[in-house]
């Protein structure tokens, strides 16, 4: 699983790319996205 901490500290990524990765993870893990 990719943690929020890892994603937010992944330099050079656009905000949408972070949302994209969160959402792909959400579709698999069914974590709440709010």
């Amino acid at each position: 699983a990719v943690s929020e901490h890892q994603l937010l500290h992944d330099k050079g990524k656009s905000i949408q790319d972070l949302r994209r990765r969160f959402f792909l993870h959400h579709l698999i893990a069914e974590i709440h996205t709010a």
Epitope: G12, K13, S14, I15, Q16, D17, R19, R20, F22, F23, L24, H25, H26, L27, I28, A29, E30, T33, A34
Partner: antibody, heavy 118, light 115 residues
Framework: QVQLVESGGGVVQPGRSLRLSCAAS????????MSWVRQAPGKGLEWVAT????????YYPDSVKGRFTISRDNSKNTLYLQMNSLRAEDTAVYYC???????????WGQGTLVTVSS | QLVLTQSSSASFSLGASAKLTCTLS???????IEWYQQQPLKPPKYVMD???????STGDGIPDRFSGSSSGAERYLTISSLQSEDEADYYC?????????????FGGGTKLTVL
């Protein structure tokens, strides 16, 4: 290998309903989000619906919201698309697609043709 | 509004290099997109995702002749040493989540002809 096989397409009158199925094999179906994407004859691609791995979350574009329902039966490794109040503009080949951790539509089925005509 | 714009057609010679363009709406210029290939009478196939910095990840079975790059709001798919089997429609796509709603849009597609 990943295999997705759609079925249930055919000719249907405007205003009627149809249910499409997508039989999945070659991977753990219950571990991935799934989607439907359609393509009208001679036209481009249009996203239709997405469902999370366990079926708890569903997403639709405005063009089909309230008319189409995506669902899944993980015990049968099958994805569904219930299409109600069909319109001529819903005529298309409907593809099911599987996500990966990296992208939304990584694997595609061969498609099933839905024709809405009186 | 999230919009992707593609040229409707492009022609290149066998063995040449082809560069296809997908342009994001200006306010979405940093977005990651996806490229898909659809050969005649076949379903679409995932080619790659392409980020704003030009980094990309290719799909299963995609030859290394396929590469991606970015400049501003433009996303490019480059196919080197064109083969006859590269003749296909190429679509770009982009997804986003807004207020817990998901949206995904495709460009209109580019028909690539290999001469």
């Amino acid at each position: 290998q990943v295999q997705l096989v759609e079925s249930g397409g055919g000719v249907v009158q405007p205003g009627r309903s149809l249910r499409l199925s997508c039989a999945a094999s070659g991977f753990t179906f219950s571990s991935y989000g799934m989607s439907w994407v359609r393509q009208a004859p001679g036209k481009g691609l249009e996203w239709v619906a997405t469902i999370s791995s366990g079926g708890s979350y569903t997403y639709y574009p405005d063009s089909v919201k309230g008319r189409f329902t995506i669902s899944r039966d993980n015990s049968k490794n099958t994805l569904y698309l219930q299409m109600n109040s069909l319109r001529a503009e819903d005529t298309a080949v409907y593809y099911c697609a599987r996500q990966t951790t990296m992208t939304y539509f990584a694997y595609w089925g061969q498609g099933t043709l839905v024709t809405v005509s009186s | 509004q999230l919009v992707l714009t593609q040229s409707s057609s492009a022609s290149f010679s066998l063995g040449a290099s082809a560069k296809l363009t997908c342009t994001l709406s200006s306010q979405h210029s940093t977005y990651t997109i996806e490229w898909y290939q659809q050969q005649p009478l076949k379903p679409p196939k995932y080619v790659m995702d392409l980020k704003q910095d030009g980094s990309h990840s290719t799909g299963d079975g995609i030859p290394d002749r396929f590469s991606g790059s970015s400049s501003g709001a433009e996303r490019y798919l480059t196919i080197s040493s064109l083969q006859s089997e590269d003749e296909a429609d190429y679509y770009c796509g982009v997804g986003d989540t807004i207020k817990e709603q998901f949206v995904y849009v495709f460009g209109g597609g580019t028909k690539l002809t290999v001469l």
